[in-house]
């Protein structure tokens, strides 16, 4: 018997579509071999109609396709606009039609149900609204208008113009009679239920002169849309439920084993703790549509999701819904990166952010997830240089190491920095990832003066002590600006006394500014890195004042003041609009903070070429 498997019989009606899924053993040979859908003729030959190599026969042109899913060992043949001529015997298979692996499929296309002449067909999703149009003649204008539902041989009154409403339709149906001259009345049914499905009859007047019109109402429960996303990646559910529920509370829920639906997030402020730090419900548009983004996808996120609208913020029968089936692919293209990064108060973290390597030119962003209400993620930094004012001097986004990873460094950590952060770009939204920063007990490894006042025209020497464990790392000093951190020349000065229990490899790296200029004022970072991986950083603020006493100035930790908690920016610097992320396309609207410090110029502070390429990594 053939190892290929599929539906033995497929039946449908004219004008409809079918989707035929065929399964095959997913060996490497099978995954890459030709897939086909062919029709068996009287001669026994099987004529190809569509294949995975792009062939589509003339009578399938524009209405059929074949998609291979090698990771699942399936391929799907979609055929639209079916006609009765499509009825027949087919094969789905692999390899060559005549001697490959195949499965026989019988397709039967029928005319569809016989409906009374002139019947209007209304096809509407459950929970939505239908408007049934009922024409009448002038002589029936003053007479009673009514809508009946045909159940078997009987007709049950649903609504009429004498204010009768069938209890099954209470509070969700209305009959509208237009002004004079318009010979049509309408019946509007809201929040359609599956039980509303069936044949209806409009009637105006009575006796032999009455006007009648048949309406076939087909109420469909939306079948789940299939969504395949990668482990560790991101999924966006776009939910458009219609204007009728634009002002009603919205929700996303996940169907559980009891067939009820657990709220994942809603607009009333409810959120499932399993999605803490990795979910946003983006504000709805005027048309009532909204979207939910979930990042850091896990295998256990798989399942059926429904979005809907109801004043309670949860699923209720007869209200509109949309459905998705989420599959999380474990063979992910998104590389593993730490989901939790730990730092100590006063210390730093370096976070690795993956992005689609095909989109190296995309803008990169980092935002802070906030859980209030529907969740939001105000941007903190972006690759073009925008940095939130309160992060000045302690946050930088680096393009390195490149090739699918960028790095974000945050230093001068406080307990307030603990939380969830998102890495994202203005490109492939599926590569949004989440990292949690935790502040733990401990001391920073790098020691720099708290803050420094330099004298104009003199020499300034800033020491940075590092422990022996960093002896093999590359050390650097850089001058921070909101567009990055420009590397400066620095020198190793041998052993340091800052670490008592350390061998001779404990060292000091210092930065010398000679002579100090006004442009030198600003934030400086001392850091370590190893190949592609950035390690810890420490920041020091240098203020420049007028010359008072001649001579050079050497700053040691003993003389240093405490680091300022926050530098007050010039009043001319505009604050960044604290805008939550909704769509990366909106990022361009962010206001950019003016550069608070020019890069030090001249030969005094040339860029250390060894540090511009091989960077990246994460310090835990």
């Amino acid at each position: 018997k053939s190892p290929v498997f599929g539906p033995q019989e497929v039946s449908s009606v004219e004008g409809n579509s079918v989707s035929i899924k065929c399964y095959y053993p997913p060996t490497s040979v099978n995954r890459h071999t030709r897939k086909y859908w062919c029709r068996k003729g009287a001669s026994g030959r099987c004529i190809t109609l569509v294949s995975s190599e792009g062939y589509v026969s003339s009578n399938y042109a524009g209405r059929a396709n074949l998609t291979n899913f090698p990771e699942n060992g399936t391929f799907v043949v979609n055929i639209a606009q079916l006609s009765r001529d499509d009825s027949g015997h087919y094969k789905c298979g692999l390899g060559i039609n005549s001697r490959g692996l195949s499965f026989d499929v019988s397709l039967e296309v029928s005319q569809g149900p016989e409906l009374p002449n002139g019947t209007e067909v209304y096809t509407v999703d459950v929970g939505r609204t239908v408007t049934i149009k009922c024409p009448f003649k002038t002589e029936n204008a003053p007479k009673t208008k009514a809508l009946y539902k045909k159940i078997g041989q009987t007709s049950v009154l649903v609504i009429d113009s004498r204010n009768y409403v069938n209890p099954n339709y209470k509070d969700r149906i209305r009959l509208r009679i237009p002004g004079t001259g318009q010979l049509i009345f309408t019946v509007v049914i809201d929040r359609l239920r599956l039980s509303d499905h069936g044949l209806y009859l409009c009637q105006a007047g009575d006796g032999s002169n009455r006007d009648e019109k048949n309406a076939d109402l087909q109420v469909l429960e939306p079948e789940p849309e299939l969504v395949y996303e990668d482990l560790r990646g991101s999924v966006t559910f776009h939910c458009a439920l219609g204007l009728e529920v634009a002002n009603v509370a919205k929700f996303l829920c996940r169907v559980n084993s009891r067939e009820t639906c657990d709220v994942v997030i809603n607009t009333l402020g409810k959120r499932d703790s399993a999605f803490e730090g990795r979910i946003l419900l983006n504000p709805q548009d005027k048309d009532g549509s909204f979207s939910v983004v979930i990042t850091g996808l896990r295998k256990e996120d798989e399942g059926r999701y429904l979005c809907g609208a109801h004043s309670d913020g949860q699923l209720q029968e007869g209200w509109p819904i949309q459905a998705w089936q989420l599959f999380v692919n474990e063979e992910s293209t998104i590389p593993r990166s730490p989901t939790v990064v730990k730092g100590v108060a006063g210390g730093s973290v370096a976070v690795l952010c993956p992005y689609n390597p095909k989109e190296s030119q995309s803008l990169k962003y980092w935002c802070l997830w906030e859980g209030a209400q529907n969740g939001r993620c105000p941007l903190l930094v972006e690759s073009q240089g925008l940095v939130q004012e309160q992060y000045e001097g302690r946050l930088s986004l680096l393009q390195e190491p490149g090739n699918g990873t960028f790095t974000v460094i945050l230093n001068q950590l406080t307990t307030q920095d603990a939380g969830f952060y998102w890495c994202l770009t203005n490109g492939d939204t599926r590569w949004r990832t989440t990292v949690e920063i935790k502040i733990i007990e401990g001391e920073p490894n790098l020691k720099v003066p708290g803050n420094v006042t330099a004298v104009l025209g003199e020499t300034l020497n800033i020491p940075c002590h590092f422990p022996c464990k960093f002896s093999s790392y590359e050390k650097y000093w850089c001058k921070w600006s909101n567009t990055g951190c420009q590397t400066l020349p620095s020198q190793d000065e041998g052993p340091s006394e800052a670490f008592v229990n350390c061998d001779e490899n404990s060292r000091l790296v210092s930065l010398t500014l000679n002579p100090v200029t006004r442009a030198d004022e600003g934030w400086y970072w001392c850091g370590v890195k190893q190949g592609h991986f950035y390690g810890e950083t420490a920041a020091v603020y240098v203020a420049v004042e007028e010359k008072k006493v001649a001579g050079s100035r050497y700053v040691s930790p003993a003389k240093a003041d405490a680091a300022p908690d926050e530098k007050v920016l010039d009043s001319g610097v505009r604050e960044i609009e604290n805008k939550a992320i909704q769509d990366p396309r909106l990022f361009a609207e962010e206001k950019v903070v003016a550069d608070t410090g020019d890069q030090a110029g001249g030969s005094r502070a040339s860029v250390d070429s060894s540090s511009s390429e091989e960077q990246g990594g994460s310090s835990k």
Epitope: E223, P224, E259
Partner: nanobody, 129 residues
């Protein structure tokens, strides 16, 4: 919760016929797929037949061992799925289980037990020689 109740099992002679019924009740969501599985004494549960419906289209599946002998069908109005079993053989002796799931075409392989969220208690079919 969706409840599934099987009926129609019994004792039949080789070559005889039986019709099994699977009635669904209490469903919160529409069921889009129903499968029949069987478990013979001392053996693992195996796939027999399944039906998926999507809009106006219906897809029927059958295991090689029952092709041409067993037919699956459904009665929409009654919320019932039937398994018509003809030309029965002693090797068809087993407890027959009905399974259902709200996931239709997008769902997993119909032959996989994990593709069904709801199961009935089973009905015994004995084919004597």
């Amino acid at each position: 919760q969706v409840q599934l109740v099987e009926s129609g099992g019994g004792l039949v002679q080789t070559g005889g016929s039986l019709r099994l019924s699977c009635a669904a009740s209490g469903r919160t969501f529409s069921v889009y797929r129903v499968g029949w599985f069987r478990q013979a004494p001392g053996k693992e549960r195996e796939f027999v037949a399944a039906v998926i419906w999507s809009g106006a289209s219906t897809y029927k599946y059958a295991a090689d061992s029952v092709k041409g002998r067993f037919t699956i069908s459904r009665d929409n109005a009654e919320n019932t799925v039937y398994l018509q079993m003809n030309s029965l053989k002693p090797e068809d002796t087993a407890v027959y289980y009905c399974a259902a799931d709200p996931l239709g075409l997008p769902g997993p392989d119909v032959r996989v037990e994990g593709g069904y969220r709801h199961w009935g208690q089973g009905t015994l079919v004995t084919v004597s020689s």
